[in-house]
C-alpha cells in the first residue's frame, strides 16, 4: 500500500543584499498567468548559481514569495511583480513560504518499537 504525501508549510523572513549581478533568481506567477491552479501568487522558478540568493542558501526553487520589503505580492500582474523586485533597492527583505514534502509511511505500518522483519 502506498504512503500518503503531506506537505509541511513554513514561513521565513529572508534578508538579501543585492550582489553585483542582482538578487539571482527567477519568478513565475501573477494574476495574469497562474503558476499554481487557483493561486495567483509569485513563485521562485530558478535560483541562479553564485547569485545572492544561492550564496545565502535559504531561498529555494518552488518557494512562494509573499512580500518584498513589506509589500504584499497578492493580486499582482506578473510584470508588476518583476518591476517591484527590480526596484526593490540594495537591501531586500523577502517573506517566503516553503512547502516541504513529507512522505508518511504506508497505512498499517509497524510501530516504532517493532522489528522490521
Amino acid at each position: 500500500m502506498n504512503g500518503r504525501v503531506d506537505y509541511l508549510v513554513t514561513e521565513e523572513e529572508i534578508n538579501l543584499t543585492r550582489g553585483p549581478s542582482g538578487l539571482g533568481f527567477n519568478i513565475v506567477g501573477g494574476t495574469d498567468q497562474q503558476y499554481v491552479s487557483n493561486d495567483s501568487g509569485i513563485y521562485v522558478s530558478r535560483i541562479k548559481e553564485n547569485g545572492a540568493a544561492a550564496l545565502d542558501g535559504r531561498l529555494q526553487e518552488g518557494d512562494k514569495i509573499l512580500s518584498v520589503n513589506g509589500q504584499d505580492l497578492k493580486n499582482l500582474l506578473h510584470q508588476d511583480a518583476v518591476d517591484l523586485f527590480r526596484n526593490a533597492g540594495y537591501a531586500v527583505s523577502l517573506r517566503v513560504q516553503h512547502r516541504l514534502q513529507v512522505q508518511n509511511g504506508p497505512i498499517g505500518h509497524r510501530g516504532e518499537g517493532d522489528p522490521s522483519g
Epitope: S21, G22, I27, V28, G30, Q33, H78
Partner: nanobody
C-alpha cells in the same frame, strides 16, 4: 548557437522615427530573453530595452529611463524577430544599436538587465540623429 542580424538603422532628423529589427536563428526564439543595447562614440555599451517571454503566456518588458515613453520593444515569435520602435529621436540617441539574446526559459529574472547576462550579440546597426 544563436545568430542575430539587425537592420533598420539609418540617419534621421531630431524628432523623427526609426524601427529596428533583429532576426534570430539557431534556437527556439520564444525561449530567448532579448534586449537592445547601444554604444555611442567614445562611450561604453549601455542597456536600452529588454523583452522576454516568460513561458506562462505573457511578455515582459523593461526600459532604461532615458527612452521610456519614446521607445517600444516588442517581439514576433512566429517571425523570430525582435523590434525596437524609436520615436521622437534625439541627437543623444546616436549610437550603434546591438541586439542581444540570452536563453532563460524558466520564468522572469528579478534582476535588472546586465550585458554580462547576454550570450549572443548581433553585429550592430548605426543610428544617427542630427
Amino acid at each position: 548557437e544563436v545568430q542575430l542580424v539587425e537592420s533598420g538603422g539609418g540617419s534621421v532628423q531630431a524628432g523623427g522615427s526609426l524601427r529596428l529589427s533583429c532576426a534570430a536563428s539557431g534556437r527556439t526564439f520564444s525561449s530567448l530573453r532579448m534586449a537592445w543595447f547601444r554604444q555611442a562614440p567614445g562611450k561604453e555599451r549601455e542597456f536600452v530595452a529588454e523583452n522576454w517571454w516568460n513561458g506562462q503566456g505573457g511578455q515582459g518588458v523593461w526600459y532604461v529611463d532615458s527612452v521610456k515613453g519614446r521607445f517600444t520593444i516588442s517581439r514576433d515569435n512566429a517571425k523570430n524577430t525582435l523590434y525596437l520602435q524609436m520615436n521622437n529621436l534625439k541627437p543623444e540617441d546616436t549610437a550603434v544599436y546591438y541586439c542581444a539574446a540570452h536563453r532563460d526559459d524558466s520564468g522572469s529574472t528579478v534582476d535588472p538587465p546586465n550585458q554580462s547576462d547576454y550570450d549572443y550579440w548581433g553585429q550592430g546597426t548605426q543610428v544617427t540623429v542630427s
